[in-house]
């Protein structure tokens, strides 16, 4: 599924990401835009053999199990396929664990490079939430 901007904002708010651990909703929508272009089925292979999955491009070396990433930690205790669902519950639950580590949203390279320090509220402007 490819979400609309405001549709994703509403879904993320419903799933408790607005101000989760201090990160406003705009941060999460911005991250999703530049990680996956709002596409829940996005996958991208990394040079280390791991793969990033789903709307927030969650990595298989650390967070999920795809059966093909050597030494996977699977910290979210989920199959990576769950992160490709049109239901973003699994991606959000896992993202909450990721952001609860010391690096916060810096764990997402796209957020760090494209969203951090910008007017992230623009990503939810005009949305009826």
């Amino acid at each position: 599924k490819v979400f609309g901007r405001c549709e994703l904002a509403a879904a993320m708010k419903r799933h408790g990401l607005d101000n989760y651990r201090g990160y406003s909703l705009g941060n999460w929508v911005c991250a999703a835009k530049f990680e996956s272009n709002f596409n829940t089925q996005a996958t991208n292979r990394n040079t280390d053999g791991s793969t990033d999955y789903g709307i927030l491009q969650i990595n298989s070396r650390w967070w999920c199990n795809d059966g093909r990433t050597p030494g996977s930690r699977n910290l979210c205790n989920i199959p990576c396929s769950a992160l490709l669902s049109s239901d973003i519950t699994a991606s959000v639950n896992c993202a909450k664990k990721i952001v609860s580590d010391g690096n916060g949203m810096n764990a997402w390279v796209a957020w760090r490079n494209r969203c951090k320090g910008t007017d992230v509220q623009a990503w939810i402007r005009g949305c009826r939430l």
């Epitope: 708010k13 419903r14 799933h15 408790g16 990401l17 607005d18 101000n19 989760y20 651990r21 201090g22 650390w62 930690r73 699977n74 910290l75 639950n93 909450k96 664990k97 609860s100 580590d101 010391g102 690096n103």
Partner: antibody, heavy 113, light 107 residues
Framework: EVQLQESGPSLVKPSQTLSLTCSVT????????WSWIRKFPGNKLEYMGY???????FYNPSLKSRISITRDTFKNQLYLQLNSVTTEDTATYYC???????WGQGTTVTVHH | DILMTQTPATLSVTPGDSVSLSCRAS??????LHWFQQKSHESPRLLIK???QSISGIPSRFSGSGSGTDFTLSINTVETEDFGMYFC?????????FGGGTKLEIK
């Protein structure tokens, strides 16, 4: 099946340091986030802090100057240290997996002269 | 810190009744609310995560609802093994905080 077991002295004197160990079996502690939570007499629960897979620690600000959570990845153990204890620190101390799925059985610590 | 308030403090029910336990947050916490059951001399047991998500191995008579500041744990047809303390906990903002608990007792 993940199992957690707390251990440590049941009696600590005021002003001393409370030191507890949580031994984890069934999973590597580097594959999770691990918490210390305590329950006071009268049923109040307090989330003391947690340590993440990367070793990052988060402490309840009410305890920040007194608390330390560490780990030994080879022994697969977590540690809680609470300095300068008072009678107000009398409680049952639990280690738990961060998601709340797994808990130790708890160990009761009394602070008393 | 976010203050979590549970009501009532004690609930007296007969097995077979259906009950609702309330938890209120002092500010919005989205769906970042979890419910635990604790029986005497036992560790807490996770019943519901993220306000309404079920937990493997927990009987289907337990369900959760709510978002923002008001949450409810419902037990559809209470069984004798359900008596004990129930706590809510928020994980939206650090430090995470618990409610004061509701004691579910036999009438």
């Amino acid at each position: 099946e993940v199992q957690l077991q707390e251990s440590g002295p049941s009696l600590v004197k005021p002003s001393q340091t409370l030191s507890l160990t949580c031994s984890v079996t069934g999973d590597s502690i580097t594959r999770g986030y691990w918490s210390w939570i305590r329950k006071f007499p009268g049923n109040k629960l307090e989330y003391m802090g947690y340590i993440s897979y990367s070793g990052s620690t988060f402490y309840n600000p009410s305890l920040k100057s007194r608390i330390s959570i560490t780990r030994d990845t080879f022994k697969n153990q977590l540690y809680l240290q609470l300095n300068s204890v008072t009678t107000e620190d009398t409680a049952t101390y639990y280690c738990a997996e961060y998601d709340g799925t797994y808990w130790g059985q708890g160990t009761t610590v009394t602070v008393h002269h | 810190d976010i203050l979590m308030t549970q009501t009532p403090a004690t609930l007296s029910v007969t097995p077979g009744d259906s009950v609702s336990l309330s938890c209120r947050a002092s500010q919005s916490i989205g769906n970042n609310l979890h419910w635990f059951q604790q029986k005497s001399h036992e560790s807490p047991r996770l019943l519901i995560k993220y306000a309404s998500q079920s937990i493997s191995g927990i009987p289907s008579r337990f369900s959760g609802s709510g978002s923002g500041t008001d949450f409810t744990l419902s037990i559809n047809t209470v069984e004798t093994e359900d008596f004990g303390m129930y706590f809510c906990q928020q994980s939206n903002s650090w430090p995470y905080t618990f409610g004061g608990g509701t004691k579910l007792e036999i009438k």
